[in-house]
Amino acid sequence: PRSIDVKYIGVKSAYVSYDVQKRTIYLNITNTLNITNNNYYSVEVENITAQVQFSKTVIGKARLNNITIIGPLDMKQIDYTVPTVIAEEMSYMYDFCTLISIKVHNIVLMMQVTVTTTYFGHSEQISQERYQYVDCGRNTTYQLGQSEYLNVLQPQQ
C-alpha cells in the first residue's frame, strides 16, 4: 500500500463568545485538513480526533466519525470544529481577550489531530501537531495558513 498523506492546513475560522459572570471564553475553532490517498483503491476516513491546548492545558476536544471515503489517487479537504473553553485557572485570559485597548488578541494554541483511515480491514493512524495563532477578541475568518505560529519553540503563553 502507498501512503495516505494528512496535511494540517490551518485555522479556517474562530468564533468567540463570553460568559461575563464566569469570566470564561468560548472559542469555536474550525480547522482544515487535506487528506490525500496515494493508493489505487479507495480508503475510508473512519474518524478524526482533535484536541486543542493552551499553555499546556487541554481546552477542547472533538471527534468526528464515519467522515468520508476518498477515491483512488484523490484528495479531500475536510473541515472540523473544536469547541474550546478558557476558564478557571486561566480566567486572566478573559481580562486580556476582552480588553478593547488591544487591537489584536492573539493567543497561541497547539492543535493536535489524529486521522484514522481504513482499507481492506486494515486501520492506520496519522497524527499532526501545529501551533496556531487565534484571536480571542473577535470572530475571525482566516486565509488558509494565515494563522500559523512559526516559532519552533514552545511559546510561553
Partner: antibody, heavy 117, light 112 residues
Framework: EVQLVESGGGLVKPGGSLKLSCAAS????????MSWVRETPEKRLEWVAF????????YYADNVKDRFTISRDNAKNNLYLQMRHLKSEDTAMYYC??????????WGQGTLVTVSV | DIVMTQAAFSNPVTLGTSASISCRSS???????????LFWYLQKPGQSPQLLIY???NLASGVPDRFSSSGSGTDFTLRISRVEAEDVGVYYC?????????FGGGTKLEIK
C-alpha cells in the same frame, strides 16, 4: 494577596521631572495590562497612560502625551511613569492600577505629586 | 472623547434604605462583542478607588450583593439595596470602550 505599591512622588518645580514606580506582587504581573490613573485636587479621576502585558501597546491621555513615558519591567514586576516638563495641572495623587477587560481590578495606595514653585 | 455625566450628589438616603446613582455616556458603550464597557468604582474617604461593577452589570470579587447595576448602551444606574455606613464615599462611572478611558465626575453618597 494582590498588592500594588507606588513610590517616587514628591514636590517638584514646574518644568521639572519625576519618575514614579509601582511594585506589583501577588499575581503574575506579565499576564496583565497596567494603567496609571490620577486624582486631581478637585477629586476628579483621570486616566493617564496604559501599557499592555508585553509592552506592545502604549497609550497616553492627550494632556500628557510627549511629556510622560510609561514602561514596565516584567522580570522585576515593576511599572514606571517617567514624567518630564511637569506643569501645575499635573499635581495629583497618582495610582497604578491593574487593567483589563474587567476594569481596574486593583489599585495601589497612590503617590502624591505636587508641582509648585 | 466619550463624556461621562454624573450628578455631583445623590439624594440623601437613610441607612437601611435603597439608593440609586445614575450615569450617562455621550456614546453607546455596547461593543460588537456583546459586552458593555461601563464600570463603577467607589472611593471611600482617604482610600484608593475600588472596583464595584465590571462590564455594566457584573459584581466584582468581594463586593456585597447589595450592589447591582443595570442600563442600556448610554444610561446606567447603580443601586444599593440596603445602604450601610461603610457605603459612604464617591461613586464613579467609567467607560473603557475607547481611549482615552473617561471617568464621570463622581457622585457623593449622602446619608441623612
Amino acid at each position: 494577596e494582590v498588592q500594588l505599591v507606588e513610590s517616587g512622588g514628591g514636590l517638584v518645580k514646574p518644568g521639572g521631572s519625576l519618575k514614579l514606580s509601582c511594585a506589583a506582587s501577588g499575581f503574575t504581573f506579565s499576564n496583565y495590562a497596567m494603567s496609571w490613573v490620577r486624582e486631581t485636587p478637585e477629586k476628579r479621576l483621570e486616566w493617564v497612560a496604559f501599557i499592555s502585558d508585553g509592552g506592545g501597546y502604549i497609550y497616553y491621555a492627550d494632556n500628557v502625551k510627549d511629556r510622560f513615558t510609561i514602561s514596565r519591567d516584567n522580570a522585576k514586576n515593576n511599572l514606571y511613569l517617567q514624567m518630564r516638563h511637569l506643569k501645575s495641572e499635573d499635581t495629583a495623587m497618582y495610582y497604578c492600577a491593574r487593567d483589563g477587560g474587567t476594569g481596574f481590578t486593583y489599585w495601589g495606595q497612590g503617590t502624591l505629586v505636587t508641582v509648585s514653585v | 472623547d466619550i463624556v461621562m455625566t454624573q450628578a455631583a450628589f445623590s439624594n440623601p438616603v437613610t441607612l437601611g434604605t435603597s439608593a440609586s446613582i445614575s450615569c450617562r455616556s455621550s456614546k453607546s458603550l455596547l461593543h460588537s462583542n456583546g459586552i458593555t464597557y461601563l464600570f463603577w468604582y467607589l472611593q471611600k474617604p482617604g482610600q484608593s478607588p475600588q472596583l464595584l461593577i465590571y462590564q455594566m452589570s457584573n459584581l466584582a470579587s468581594g463586593v456585597p450583593d447589595r450592589f447591582s447595576s443595570s442600563g442600556s448602551g448610554t444610561d446606567f444606574t447603580l443601586r444599593i439595596s440596603r445602604v450601610e455606613a461603610e457605603d459612604v464615599g464617591v461613586y464613579y462611572c467609567v467607560q473603557n470602550l475607547e481611549l482615552p478611558y473617561t471617568f464621570g465626575g463622581g457622585t457623593k453618597l449622602e446619608i441623612k
